[in-house]
């Protein structure tokens, strides 16, 4: 049997399989030792017993997508049954007071492979032996402590298969510069050891793609705003805007980014290279924010053109290699190409409240001569639209340790002038964090007051 | 002269539904928050529901969470309380009120029987 | 059971000073204004004190509102015949979430 065979149906183009080499991966026309890896069907019933007290999963992700030439990570974790885990020396042992369907196991291990290793024999002096092979029959790499890793991952995809000796967690990087753009699939089959050969345990796939647009995200922030993730905001209030580019792999650190805003709002184009930018929108309504990335990225150089045909003989103007047409290609060239990213986002423009401000405040006299706890009024004032929730929380002077959160719906008028009592149970200095807030808005405002004792000639301070 | 007109109210079997309204007049309906309020006969006040000037918040009594809704529309000036599942206890005058923190003017109610 | 506590009843002959109290917890008076409302036979409440002790124009200065910790009171001087109605009180109560009224005071005027 050759790998495509084994490891999946979907058979790329032979374009694709002639072309589109990946460094350090191998053709899928090669073929596979079944003695040493055995191949089973969907639905077999020899899956059930392939693993010691269940199945084992396997879980594929990658950090797709992937702007074409940089590197896409792909990362494999292996889930084992409940109660077990993989040690130190990569066995597989139960953990300790856990029970699962068969109760508490008196054997430790589930697999013991390092006591397998130690019994085998048939191995020359370099460790090296005919079982110590991959699928395809190239030896292992001896890595130190190499026999620790007693799982086998083939990756299989775009009619090429890479293969890893790994413990219960590979990961493998992939440059995609010879990759075609778009979704491609990514297969894995789990191989374990088992004496001599190997007993497959999971096979698991996954969606990556790649792209020649940058991938592009925005993150929007303003103060007041009650809910950054419904892309409503204030009016009268700066947004600002964060652009973060998908670039795991760091392909874009040397390029320089340039970030083209449409804020939808008649106020024109706005071009930088920094990637946050504030903008405010003094208007209510619905706009179209539009974001254009361009980067100059490493990529493939255009072919060079072909040279003149002088139509008679001309003297050469100086030595060999001076031509500078000989000089626009040369072996190791680095040649840029300019890659571009979008963003669009509706944003709603609504009225908010923007600003609250403690005007004063003010000890209530109680009717009792020596009442336990002091009545404080604060008298606040606010900007913008009419809020119908006040919270004040209550806390020690470092503002840090709550001592108590009171919310309740105010009616305000359109002057916005109200006053908040609140309890204060025993003299000192409390840190007052008080906000106002409607729908879409909550505004802060917080201040420092210092209650006395209950000694009716002690004035009430704002702390500084 | 600030006027709150409830109407809606009836009999309505068990498990019915029964739509409240409340027209308002003689202040700005849109910028301030309304709320309901009930009281059973021979009974002392029990708040219903509360709701914000723009209609973006809205609060409940537990004893009618989940059945009751609040609504308004600023265009006709009009507060509005669905009733579904009723119960015989949710029997008694329904009062519109205005405001929320305290309910500084009060409609003549209408009465919600719940009988079969 | 209300979440505030009211009397059931008061009463006092004209003239006199009646005092109807209102005792809650530090999540409704203690931390939020307090409210009353009278409600003559046969007709919708009508608010009396707002904001603890403020009187909305058109209530007369016999009525009087005061608040200590988390205990509040109504008190009328130079009670009257048509004095005689329910009084509720009523606050916010922040860890609830919901509007809480008293079970209400019967005020009767003797005499």
């Known amino acids: 049997k050759r790998f495509h065979d084994v490891l999946g149906n979907e058979r790329p183009s032979a374009y694709m399989r002639e072309h589109n080499q990946l460094n350090g991966w191998s053709s899928d026309e090669n073929d596979w030792n079944e003695k040493l890896y055995p191949v089973w069907k969907r639905g077999d019933m020899r899956w059930k017993n392939s693993w010691k007290g269940g199945r084992v999963q396997a879980v594929l992700t990658s950090d797709s997508p992937a702007l074409v030439g940089s590197n896409i990570t792909f990362a494999v974790n292996l889930i084992f049954p409940r109660c077990q885990k993989e040690d130190a020396n990569g066995n597989i042992v139960y953990e300790k007071n856990c029970r699962n369907e068969a109760g508490l196991s008196a054997d430790p291990y589930v697999y013991n492979w390092t006591a397998w290793s130690e019994d085998s024999d048939g191995e020359n002096g370099t460790g090296q032996s005919h079982h110590n092979v991959f699928p395809d029959g190239k030896p292992f790499p001896h890595h130190p402590g190499w026999r620790r890793w007693n799982f086998i991952y083939v990756f299989h995809t775009l009619g090429q298969y890479f293969q890893k000796l790994g413990r219960c967690s590979v990961r493998v990087s992939v440059n995609t510069a010879n990759v075609t753009l778009g979704p491609q699939l990514m297969e894995v089959t789990v191989y374990r050891r088992h004496g001599r050969a190997y007993v497959p345990i999971a096979q698991v796939k996954d969606v990556y793609v790649v792209t020649d647009q940058i991938p592009v995200f925005v993150t929007m922030f303003q103060k007041n705003d009650r809910n950054s993730s419904d892309e409503t905001f204030l009016k009268d209030l700066p947004i600002m805007f964060d652009v973060l580019i998908h670039d795991p792999s760091h392909f874009l650190n040397y390029s320089t980014i340039n970030y083209k805003w449409s804020f939808g709002d008649n106020t024109g184009l706005f071009v930088s290279t920094n990637h946050t930018v504030n903008h405010t929108y003094v208007l209510n309504g619905t706009f179209s924010l539009n974001l254009t990335v361009k980067a100059a990225a490493p990529g493939p150089c255009p072919p060079p053109p072909p040279p003149p045909r002088p139509s008679k003989p001309t003297p050469s103007l100086g030595p060999a290699g001076d031509n500078p047409l000989e000089l626009s290609r040369i072996p190791d060239e680095n040649c840029q190409i300019n890659r571009y990213g979008h963003f669009q986002a509706t944003i709603t423009i609504v009225e908010g409240i923007l600003e609250v401000n403690i005007i004063q405040m003010t000890d209530v006299l109680m009717p009792v001569p020596w009442p336990e706890s002091s009545l404080i009024d604060f008298v606040v004032t606010c900007q913008g639209s009419i809020p119908t929730e006040v919270c004040t929380i209550i806390s020690d002077p470092t503002c840090e340790i709550t001592q108590n959160t009171v919310c309740s719906p105010v009616d305000v008028d359109e002057m916005c002038l109200l006053t908040v009592r609140r309890t204060f149970n025993g003299s000192g200095t409390y840190c007052v964090n008080l906000t106002l807030g409607d729908d879409t808005s909550l505004a802060l405002t917080s201040t420092l007051i210092s209650v006395p004792d209950r000694d009716p000639a002690s004035p009430l301070r704002m702390a500084n | 002269e600030v006027q709150l007109l409830e109407s809606g109210g009836g009999l309505v079997q068990p498990g019915g539904s029964l739509r409240l309204s409340c027209a308002a007049s003689g202040f700005t309906f849109r910028k301030l928050n309304m709320s309901w309020v009930r009281q059973a006969p021979g009974k002392g006040l029990e708040w219903v529901s509360s709701?914000?000037?723009?209609?973006?918040?809205?609060y409940y009594a537990d004893s009618v969470k989940g059945r009751f809704t609040i609504s308004r529309d600023n265009s006709k000036n009009t507060l509005y309380l669905q009733m579904n599942s009723l119960r015989a206890e949710d029997t008694a005058v329904y009062y519109c009120?205005?405001?929320?923190?305290?309910?500084?003017?009060w409609g003549q109610g209408t009465l919600v029987t719940v009988s079969s | 059971q209300s979440v505030l506590t009211q009397p059931p009843s008061a009463s006092g002959t004209p003239g006199q000073r009646v005092t109807i109290s209102c005792s809650g917890s530090?999540?409704?008076?203690?931390?939020?204004?307090v409210s009353w409302y009278q409600q003559l036979p046969g007709t919708a409440p009508k608010l009396l004190i707002y904001a603890d002790s403020q009187r909305p124009s058109g209530v007369p200065d016999r009525f009087s509102g005061s608040k200590s910790g988390t205990s509040a009171s109504l008190a009328i001087s130079g009670l009257r015949s048509e004095d005689e109605a329910d009084y509720y009180c009523g606050a916010w109560d922040s860890s609830l979430n919901a509007y809480v009224f008293g079970g209400g005071t019967k005020l009767t005027v003797l005499g």
């Open positions: 009120a205005r405001k929320w923190s305290t309910f500084d003017y």
């Open positions: 530090s999540s409704n008076i203690g931390n939020n204004y």
């Open positions: 709701i914000s000037h723009s209609g973006g918040s809205k």
